[in-house]
């Protein structure tokens, strides 16, 4: 039985050219995690292997930094970074929890940190 | 099996600069941060920073910025911390540690510095 | 910055007694919450990763638990050997920050 429960930064907003931390946190479970995902849309950014460390895909290497913890710090933010990331924890023995950000590029200097939510 | 061979001891004047160096092995050092963590004699553990080999990413302590500056030489699998204007306050044990998201897993054995005139 | 405060400062312990060391956090950290121990004249050694994630080669004896701010590293029967300093660390934002320590010592 999956007990665990997501936390995610939620709906969140930030400037053109400026960074912005994408955060997942697993909680009210016992269970392993081996591996997460970080995913843009069907595009993956990184993985961070409880094993192997971390593996950037290529094409994000010179703008993502891994952290803090098991989250990644996107940076020099573009409109087209707009859309929905996913954070895909793999644990033994519960299996995959999946939380959902959704981030908007704002050209302004009106962006806000949206509220935490929950993914039971 | 990963290991983490720190450069040894070091005994400096006030002023000077400093460079050690941790040398990673067993793993690949551009899938981990390296974290640098400070020991003063009797004291806790405090956070300097952290460099990530794999893009040159690196995170400061504020209260370290200007003081400790992070490198690495992905082709040496070597991180370095160069201290500046040495006084007695920086007279501690410095400690490389790497972080793959996970905790900090591996430490090297520390570098004692003396700064002393 | 996210202050980690340790209690208490120092535990006096009979080997076989069971112990508990508390850490609380300034602002809500989730489960980023790392205990590490420390033997004299040693480098710190990961414990219990993310509140309560046991580490392979630690013994089973050390547990964590907690979420939030309040988070607590357990010892069922401590052994000579388990004597020295404990940290904990959080990995929820930069900076990493450590709590100040837990001695435990022998009473």
């Known amino acids: 039985m999956m007990t665990g429960t997501i936390e995610t930064t939620g709906n969140i907003s930030a400037e053109k050219g400026g960074s912005i931390i994408l955060q997942c946190h697993l909680s009210s479970t016992t269970a392993q995690v081996t591996q997460v995902n970080w995913e843009q849309q069907d595009q993956l950014l990184a993985i961070c292997n409880a094993d192997l460390g971390w593996h950037i895909s290529p094409s994000f290497k010179d703008r993502v930094a891994p952290g803090p913890g098991l989250g990644l710090t996107l940076q020099s933010l573009t409109v087209n970074d707009t859309g929905e990331y996913f954070c895909i924890y793999h644990t033994y023995p519960d299996g995959t929890y999946t939380g959902r950000i959704f981030l908007e590029v704002l050209e302004s200097s009106v962006a806000e940190h949206g509220a935490r939510f929950q993914i039971p | 099996e990963v290991q983490l061979q720190q450069s040894g001891t070091v005994l400096a004047r006030p002023g000077a600069s400093v460079k050690m160096s941790c040398k990673a092995s067993?793993?690949?050092?551009?899938?981990?941060?390296m974290h640098w963590v400070k020991q003063r004699p009797g004291q806790g553990l405090e956070w300097i920073g952290g460099?990530?080999?794999?893009?040159?990413?690196?995170n400061y302590n504020q209260k370290f910025k200007g003081k400790a500056k992070l490198t690495a030489v992905t082709s040496a699998s070597t991180a370095y911390m160069e201290l500046s204007s040495l006084t007695n306050e920086d007279s501690a044990v410095y400690y490389c540690?790497?972080?793959?998201?996970?905790?900090?897993?591996?430490w090297g054995q520390g570098t004692s510095v003396t700064v002393s005139s | 910055d996210v202050v980690l405060t340790q209690s208490p400062a120092t535990l006096s312990v009979t080997p076989g007694d069971s112990v508990s060391l508390s850490c609380r956090a300034s602002?809500?950290?989730?489960?980023?919450l790392h205990w590490y121990q420390q033997k004299s004249h040693e480098s710190p050694r990961l414990l219990i990763k993310?509140?309560?994630q046991s580490i392979s080669g630690i013994p089973s004896r050390f547990s964590g638990s907690g979420s939030g701010t309040d988070f607590t590293l357990s010892i069922n029967s401590v052994e000579t050997e388990d004597f020295g300093m404990y940290f904990c660390?959080?990995?929820?934002?930069?900076?990493?920050?450590f709590g100040g320590g837990t001695k435990l010592e022998i009473k």
């Open positions: 540690t790497r972080e793959g998201g996970y905790g900090m897993d591996y």
């Open positions: 602002q809500t950290i989730s489960n980023n």
């Open positions: 660390q959080q990995s929820y934002s930069w900076p990493y920050t």
């Open positions: 993310y509140s309560s």
């Open positions: 460099v990530y080999p794999g893009n040159s990413n690196t």
């Open positions: 067993g793993y690949s050092i551009t899938s981990y941060w």
